[in-house]
């Protein structure tokens, strides 16, 4: 706690300017009026204050706004935002996308901090859903943002927002998240023609069910192996050799290099060896000719 000392004669700040850089911490506390600071917050970011000086300025704002800062101040916090705790941020009511952008800009290039996560959470909850403009903004600053949300949180993403999602935004998503996002993407892109549809839906296919993969196999899409390897194993297993061949097109040759990895390994185990042989890739591990295939999952369901 900075001691309450009187401001020395002639040092009372009339405006927030660079002369304050040379004030000691106690002089800043004594000579800078909190209301003046609040109205000239946009200047603070342009002045190279030390971290210790920023602590004093934050303290003054905290005293002026014990219930939380108004948005007019929040928008111009600049580097002072880095001094805020998640507890401070929970008191805010941030409604403007411009305010959100201004604060994300301060943290640009760094990992998502607890402060930023709290800010985003407050903002999204205030809006009620992750609209397209918000998603656009968040994924521009944090490409992995979408994959940091729980399936429950993702359920609030409207299909229209899916247009803002780029392939790299989904790189770290797990199957549970893609399960939620895929139906939204399917709905968002439903009016596109075959090839255009596939380009857009490709990143989301980790959440696609078997029937959708079967439908895609009829459209000459030529899925690459990287996409195929991200498909749900349970969605791939029921596909026939002919369907996988159609789905992958010229990329089918890549199966050989992936034969020991899921889902290819598990899919091979479910195929007849003579069907696999028709691919001419030397894939081994299929069901030998003459063996009966029992669907154990069906048998368990019946018993």
């Amino acid at each position: 706690e900075v001691e309450k000392t009187a401001c020395p004669s002639g040092k009372k700040a009339r405006e927030i300017d660079e002369s304050l850089i040379f004030y000691k911490k106690w002089e800043l506390e004594a000579c800078v009026d909190a209301a003046l600071l609040a109205t000239q917050m946009d200047r603070v970011n342009a002045i190279p204050f030390t971290y210790e000086q920023l602590d004093v300025l934050k303290h003054k704002l905290d005293e002026l706004y014990p219930q939380g800062y108004p948005e007019s101040v929040i928008q111009h916090l600049g580097y002072l935002f880095l001094k805020m705790s998640p507890e401070d941020i929970r008191k805010w009511n941030v409604t403007s996308l411009e305010t959100l952008k201004a604060l994300l800009e301060v943290n640009k290039g760094h990992e998502m901090s607890p402060q930023v996560a709290t800010l985003i959470d407050r903002f999204v909850k205030g809006r009620g859903q992750l609209d397209k403009d918000t998603l656009d903004t968040l994924t521009a600053f944090y490409p992995g943002y979408l994959c940091s949300l729980s399936p429950e949180e993702l359920s609030s993403v409207p299909p229209s927002s899916i247009w803002a999602v780029r392939p790299q935004d989904l790189d770290t998503c797990d199957p549970r998240q893609l399960d939620v996002l895929y139906p939204k993407a399917r709905l968002a892109f439903q009016n596109m023609n075959g090839s255009e549809y596939f380009v857009k839906i490709q990143s989301f296919l980790g959440g696609a069910p078997t029937e959708d993969l079967k439908a895609l196999s009829q459209q000459n899409v030529s899925m690459d192996l990287a996409t195929f390897m991200k498909l749900r194993t349970d969605a791939v297993l029921p596909l026939t050799v002919a369907e996988v061949q159609k789905l992958l097109g010229p990329h089918v040759e890549g199966l050989k290099a992936e034969e020991r990895h899921r889902p290819v390994r598990d899919w091979i185990l479910r195929q007849r060896q003579d069907d696999l042989d028709t691919l001419g890739l030397g894939l081994q591990g299929g069901i030998p000719n003459g063996y009966l295939v029992l669907d154990l999952s069906m048998q368990e369901a019946l018993s």
């Epitope: 002639g10 040092k11 660079e18 002369s19 850089i21 040379f22 946009d42 200047r43 342009a46 002045i47 190279p48």
Partner: antibody, heavy 116, light 110 residues
Framework: EVQLLESGGGLVQPGGSLRLSCAAS????????MSWVRQAPGKGLEWVSG????????YYADSVRGRFTVSRDNSKNTLYLQMNSLRAEDTAVYYC?????????WGQGTLVTVSS | QSVLTQPPSASGTPGQRVTISCTGS????????VSWYQQLPGTAPKLLIY???KRPSGVPDRFSGSKSGTSASLAISGLRSEDEADYYC???????????FGGGTKVTVL
């Protein structure tokens, strides 16, 4: 009204010395950092030196470091620039300016000519 | 060779908009505020823009400044004959422990 008035310029031989002064008025001189900026004939602006209110740290451009010394007397509201070992390339109009990170007021300048 | 890079000249007819760029690096413009100075022929420089985009009192709102990343720009809208001058950008550079200027841009009103 803020006023800055430089003096002390003139003709000097290479290797010689000069001391420039800048008398300030219209603001609380002791609260503000001050700077010197120069401009060679027909050329652009070049920052020379800066000094904080308490003279604690002093800042210099590489081109003058070790030859020029900035100082101030807050009781006289005056800024100084002691220039030693002068070279032909130091020929310029020398301006004093208020502040160190953004110069909001400038003097009219004093001409320093270094020539034999 | 100036640390900040400006175009040597710019021109326009009366009423036009002229923009001057100023390019620096992460150690100057990228981390500190930019100022713009106007120097009319035969006079001392005058502060035109400070803290990236603020105008001192008395500077017409025809002059505006902005900064993005490691670059800044000065725009003069509704160009007038009295705007014919040299314009300099400047910023503090902590890596040099000093202030750096651009080489200056001569604005001509055609």
């Amino acid at each position: 009204e803020v006023q800055l008035l430089e003096s002390g310029g003139g003709l000097v031989q290479p290797g010689g010395s000069l001391r420039l002064s800048c008398a300030a008025s219209g603001f609380t001189f002791s609260n503000y950092a001050m700077s010197w900026v120069r401009q060679a004939p027909g050329k652009g602006l070049e920052w020379v030196s800066g000094i904080p209110p308490d003279s604690g740290s002093k800042y210099y451009a590489d081109s003058v470091r070790g030859r020029f010394t900035v100082s101030r007397d807050n009781s006289k509201n005056t800024l100084y620039l002691q220039m030693n070992s002068l070279r032909a390339e130091d020929t310029a109009v020398y301006y004093c300016a208020k502040n160190m990170f953004s110069f909001d007021y400038w003097g009219q300048g004093t001409l320093v000519t270094v020539s034999s | 060779q100036s640390v900040l890079t400006q175009p040597p000249s710019a021109s326009g007819t009366p009423g036009q908009r002229v923009t001057i760029s100023c390019t620096g690096s992460s150690s100057n413009i990228g981390s500190n505020a930019v100022s713009w100075y106007q120097q009319l022929p035969g006079t001392a420089p005058k502060l035109l823009i400070y803290y990236n985009s603020k105008r001192p009192s008395g500077v017409p709102d025809r002059f505006s400044g902005s900064k993005s990343g490691t670059s800044a720009s000065l725009a003069i809208s509704g160009l007038r004959s009295e705007d014919e001058a040299d314009y300099y950008c400047g910023s503090w550079d902590p890596s040099l422990n000093g202030y750096v200027f651009g080489g200056g841009t001569k604005v001509t009103v055609l």
